[in-house]
């Protein structure tokens, strides 16, 4: 049994780190493999992660951790029974992929403005809470070329756009993702999309 592509891991900087790797051939990851991880300082538990299959030769493991702090460093040992297949280390603060924002809601009750709001995926005591910026993707359901990205670089998880910048009588969808500038993170996954109908009509004088 051989590792073809070594484990790479990302942390949500909260409670879960996800490691993925590829084996040299078809593998029943949960039956044959174990990923052991331990914080690098004295008196800390060695934890065991049971991986899941991720395609024929791919494995994925979700490592449960307490809230991450910048100096945390984990040793990782990938075992197949009594055989050590790979040994490495992982510093969560250097490989962060934020959680996806949630609760994306579109408010259209103000006639000339579309207000999008969403929730910060972190609690206020998490280091990422005040560091997230967002990208909001809005697209026309009937014309995928009619798509735009709005960068939200302020802290408040809201975006206001003039309804007049969208086509009238058309259904639009929106989704949002996050990244943390000072932690040099990758982008989060996109949130689930939400749909609304743009019923805005220009005032008669402007037609």
């Amino acid at each position: 049994m051989k590792v073809l592509q070594e484990p790479t891991c990302v942390s949500d900087y909260m409670s879960i780190s996800t490691c993925e790797w590829k084996m040299g051939g078809p593998t029943n990851c949960s039956a044959e493999l174990r990923l052991l991880y331990q914080l690098v300082f004295q008196s800390s538990e060695t934890h065991t992660c049971v991986p899941e299959n991720n395609g024929g030769v791919g494995c994925v493991c979700h490592l449960l951790m307490d809230d991450v702090v910048s100096m945390d460093n984990y040793t990782l040992d990938l075992w197949a029974g009594q055989q050590l297949l790979w040994k490495g280390s992982f510093k969560p603060s250097e490989h962060v992929k934020p959680r996806a924002p949630g609760n994306l809601t579109v408010h259209t009750n103000v006639s000339d403005t579309v207000l999008l709001t969403w929730s910060n995926p972190y609690p206020p005591d998490n280091y990422l809470y005040n560091d997230l910026t967002y990208a909001v993707n809005i697209w026309n359901e009937n014309d995928l070329a009619d798509s735009r990205i709005h960068n939200v670089t302020y802290l408040k998880p809201t975006l206001r756009i003039p309804a007049s910048t969208l086509k009238s009588g058309i259904s639009y969808r929106a989704r949002v993702r996050a990244w943390a500038q000072h932690y040099n993170t990758t982008w989060s996954e996109w949130s689930p999309s939400t749909k609304w109908y743009n019923s805005y009509r220009e005032p008669f004088e402007q037609r």
Epitope: L39, F41, Q42, S43, S44, E45, T46, H47, L64, M65, D66, D67, V69, S70, M71, D125
Partner: antibody
Framework: QVQLKQSGPGLVQPSQSLSVTCTVS????????VHWVRQSPGKGLEWLGV???????DYNAAFKSRLSISKDNSKSQVFFKMNSLQADDTAIYYC????????????WGQGTTLTVSS | DIQMTQSPASLSASVGETVTITCRAS??????LAWYQQKQGKSPQLLVY???TLAEGVPSRFSGSGSGTQFSLKINSLQPEDFGSYYC????????FGAGTKLEVK
């Protein structure tokens, strides 16, 4: 709910040993480590050692030569034994559950009060 | 071993006041610090770990801060149940505790 209940003697003669049993409920010893901490008026809180979920142990170097921690997962019991007791070992001895990946203690036993005296 | 120096050793305050307890480590312990509360005749209870993360069920009037060698625990709007002793604990090798701060009713 999570509970740790301790049993053990209150009075021990100098040079004798202390044995305390910590019986846990609401969680499994196969998933959590259990630490031992003592508290005395003179020395405050002192970490003594831990037995991890996998059965391995770590001890405070100052106590390693006279301390042993073991467990029986099936009975949900952790056993603490300290030898060669002296008067300055008089203290309250606690077992406490390890929290996740951090060696901090999220649930504690009620404590076993030990007096070492002849 | 790393030494933890807590101050003040004792503190008198009234319900509704805000108090701050500090803990200084003899060397860099990053954010590896926890705070516990202990009431008379009871076992300690975890309040904060990783210097600032509140443990489950701990009221939001408690807050931890600091990193490196200087740390503090702040209690806003003291409640009657907050009086007792407070201890810091680092978890670099080996684990050690501060000597404690006794918070009494003024």
């Amino acid at each position: 709910q999570v509970q740790l209940k301790q049993s053990g003697p209150g009075l021990v003669q100098p040079s004798q040993s202390l044995s305390v049993t910590c019986t846990v409920s609401g969680f499994s010893l196969t998933n959590y480590g259990v630490h031992w901490v003592r508290q005395s008026p003179g020395k405050g809180l002192e970490w003594l050692g831990v037995i991890w979920s996998g059965g391995s142990t770590d001890y405070n170097a100052a106590f390693k030569s006279r301390l042993s921690i073991s467990k029986d997962n099936s009975k949900s019991q952790v056993f603490f034994k300290m030898n060669s007791l002296q008067a300055d070992d008089t203290a309250i001895y606690y077992c406490a559950r390890n929290k996740g990946t951090r060696p901090v203690f999220d649930y504690w036993g009620q404590g076993t009060t030990l007096t070492v005296s002849s | 071993d790393i030494q933890m120096t807590q101050s003040p050793a004792s503190l008198s305050a009234s319900v509704g006041e805000t108090v701050t307890i500090t803990c200084r480590a003899s060397e860099n312990i990053y954010s590896y610090l926890a705070w516990y509360q202990q009431k008379q005749g009871k076992s300690p209870q975890l309040l904060v770990y990783n210097a600032k993360t509140l443990a489950e069920g701990v009221p939001s009037r408690f807050s931890g801060s600091g990193s490196g060698t200087q740390f503090s625990l702040k209690i806003n709007s003291l409640q009657p149940e907050d009086f007792g002793s407070y201890y810091c604990q680092h978890y670099v090798s080996p684990l050690t505790f501060g000597a404690g701060t006794k918070l009494e009713v003024k």
